[in-house]
Interface confidence: medium
C-alpha cells in the first residue's frame, strides 16, 4: 500500500493546478546566474511544495530552489547554458509536475537605468539616453529596447519605439508643446538568447517648451 494513499493533503494536492512559469537572469550578480519560478495560480497552497532543477548543470545533477514568499529562486554559477533542464514541483520525493526548459530561452534582462532626456534647442529635438548593465556582460549582450512615452494626461496613449542602441532622438515637432511627458524603457534579448521583457526602468518626466508665437516654433 502506498505511503501516500493515507495522506489526504497530498491527494487533495494532486487535484490542484501546479502550472508554473520561470525566467532566468544571466550574470545578474557578477558571474552568478539566477532562476525564478512561480505558480501561475496565486491561490496555490505552497506549503510543503518545493522546486528542483535537474540536468544541464555544471558539477551537480540537481539543485533545489529557495522559497521567498510566493516565488522560488536559485542563484548559482552552475547553469550549463546549453540543453534543456528539467524543472519539477515536488512534495518530498514525489514530482507533481515537470517542465523541460532551456534556460537560454527564458531570459529576462535587467531593467535599463539612468534614463534621461536632454532638449537640444538648436536642433529642435530631444535626445533620450539610458544605460544597461548588459553592455558589460559575457552572455546576454545584444538587446532590443522598447522606449515608451506619453503625454502625462493621456493615461493609456503610449507611443513605442524599438531600438537596439541606447540613444534615441525625438523630434520636437512630433510632441505637443508645453506638455509634460513621461518616458520609460525596457529590454528583451535579441540574438542568441530569447525570453521576456525586462521590468520597466523608472520613469523620467520632461516638459516640452512652449510655442514661440512669432516663429511658430517651441521655446
Amino acid at each position: 500500500e502506498s505511503g501516500y494513499a493515507q495522506n489526504g493533503d497530498l491527494e487533495d494536492a494532486e487535484l490542484d493546478d501546479y502550472s508554473f512559469s520561470c525566467y532566468s537572469q544571466l550574470e545578474v550578480n557578477g558571474s552568478q546566474h539566477s532562476l525564478t519560478c512561480a505558480f501561475e495560480d496565486p491561490d496555490v497552497n505552497t506549503t510543503n511544495l518545493e522546486f528542483e532543477i535537474c540536468g544541464a548543470l555544471v558539477e551537480v545533477k540537481c539543485l533545489n530552489f529557495r522559497k521567498l514568499q510566493e516565488i522560488y529562486f536559485i542563484e548559482t554559477k552552475k547553469f550549463l547554458l546549453i540543453g534543456k533542464s528539467n524543472i519539477c514541483v515536488k512534495v518530498g520525493e514525489k514530482s507533481l509536475t515537470c517542465k523541460k526548459i532551456d534556460l537560454t530561452t527564458i531570459v529576462k534582462p535587467e531593467a535599463p537605468f539612468d534614463l534621461s532626456v536632454i532638449y537640444r534647442e538648436g536642433a529642435n529635438d530631444f535626445v533620450v539616453t539610458f544605460n544597461t548593465s548588459h553592455l558589460q556582460k559575457k552572455y546576454v549582450k545584444v538587446l532590443m529596447h522598447d522606449v515608451a512615452y506619453r503625454q502625462e494626461k493621456d493615461e493609456n496613449k503610449w507611443t513605442h519605439v524599438n531600438l537596439s542602441s541606447t540613444k534615441l532622438t525625438l523630434l520636437q515637432r512630433k510632441l505637443q508643446p508645453a506638455a509634460m511627458y513621461e518616458i520609460k524603457v525596457r529590454s528583451i534579448p535579441d540574438h542568441y538568447f530569447k525570453g521576456f521583457w525586462s521590468e520597466w526602468s523608472p520613469s523620467y518626466y520632461f516638459r516640452t517648451p512652449e510655442i514661440n508665437n512669432s516663429s511658430g516654433e517651441m521655446d
Epitope: 545533477k61 550549463l80 546549453i82 540543453g83 534543456k84
Partner: antibody, heavy 121, light 109 residues
Framework: EVQLVESGGGLVQPGRSLRLSCAAS????????MHWVRQAPGKGLEWVSG????????GYADSVKGRFTIFRDNAKNSLYLQMNSLRAEDTALYYC??????????????WGQGTTVTVSS | AIQLTQSPSSLSASVGDRVTITCRAS??????LAWYQQKPGKAPKLLIY???SLESGVPSRFSGSGSGTDFTLTISSLQPEDFATYYC???????????FGQGTRLEIK
C-alpha cells in the same frame, strides 16, 4: 534502443562538396545537442561541429569554419553536415554523436559507427 | 581555445597492472572533463564524466579524479579487454565547442 546511423560518405575530389546525414532513433532527438567528430586514418579524435537542440547554438572547429555547415531537422530526427571546398586533410571517418548534458557536463554518450570521407583527386 | 595534453602518448602494461593516464588542460576547467575508450575499428565509448563519475555499465576498475587543470584516469587492475586508446575531452557551452586530448594508446607488454 538508442541508435545513430551516419550516411553520405564517399570518395570526392578536392574542392567539391559532400553532405553527411545522421539518422537518430530511440531517444527524444530534439532534447539533445548533437555533434560531428572525425578521425583521420591512424590519428586521434577531432571535434568538427556541434549544434544545440534548437539550432541556435552552433560551433565549428577552426579547421572547418567557413567551409562546413551543421544543421538539423528535428521533425525527421536527422542531423546533417554540409561539407564544401573539401581538402585532402578532411579525409577521415566522420562520427555523429549525441550529447548528454543531463549528466552535469556536456558528454558524448552515444556514437554512430561512422561514415568514411575520402578527398582525393 | 583550451588545449588538452595527455600523457603518456602510449604505454605498455600487463594484465593486472594498475595504470594511470593524465590529462592536463591549458587553463582551469573545473571538473568539465570526460574520458573515452576506443578500440580499433570501433566508435569511442564514454567511460567517465564530470571528471570522476562512472558511466553506467562501465566496470568499477575505471576511475577518474582531478579538477582545475590536472586530471587522471586510473585502471586499477588491467583486463585484456582494456587494451585500447583513451581520450580525455572538455567542452565549452558558449560559444559551443569541444576539445579532445591527443589520445593515449595502451598496449599489452
Amino acid at each position: 534502443e538508442v541508435q545513430l546511423v551516419e550516411s553520405g560518405g564517399g570518395l570526392v575530389q578536392p574542392g567539391r562538396s559532400l553532405r553527411l546525414s545522421c539518422a537518430a532513433s530511440g531517444f527524444t532527438f530534439d532534447d539533445h545537442a548533437m555533434h560531428w567528430v572525425r578521425q583521420a586514418p591512424g590519428k586521434g579524435l577531432e571535434w568538427v561541429s556541434g549544434i544545440s537542440w534548437n539550432s541556435r547554438g552552433i560551433g565549428y572547429a577552426d579547421s572547418v569554419k567557413g567551409r562546413f555547415t551543421i544543421f538539423r531537422d528535428n521533425a525527421k530526427n536527422s542531423l546533417y553536415l554540409q561539407m564544401n571546398s573539401l581538402r585532402a586533410e578532411d579525409t577521415a571517418l566522420y562520427y555523429c554523436a549525441k550529447d548528454e548534458y543531463s549528466r552535469g557536463y556536456y558528454v558524448l554518450d552515444v556514437w554512430g559507427q561512422g561514415t568514411t570521407v575520402t578527398v582525393s583527386s | 581555445a583550451i588545449q588538452l595534453t595527455q600523457s603518456p602518448s602510449s604505454l605498455s602494461a600487463s594484465v593486472g597492472d594498475r595504470v594511470t593516464i593524465t590529462c592536463r588542460a591549458s587553463q582551469g576547467i573545473s571538473s568539465a572533463l570526460a574520458w573515452y575508450q576506443q578500440k580499433p575499428g570501433k566508435a569511442p565509448k564514454l567511460l567517465i564524466y564530470d571528471a570522476s563519475s562512472l558511466e553506467s555499465g562501465v566496470p568499477s576498475r575505471f576511475s577518474g579524479s582531478g579538477s582545475g587543470t590536472d586530471f587522471t584516469l586510473t585502471i586499477s587492475s588491467l583486463q585484456p579487454e582494456d587494451f585500447a586508446t583513451y581520450y580525455c575531452q572538455q567542452f565549452n557551452s558558449y560559444p559551443l565547442w569541444i576539445a579532445f586530448g591527443q589520445g593515449t594508446r595502451l598496449e599489452i607488454k
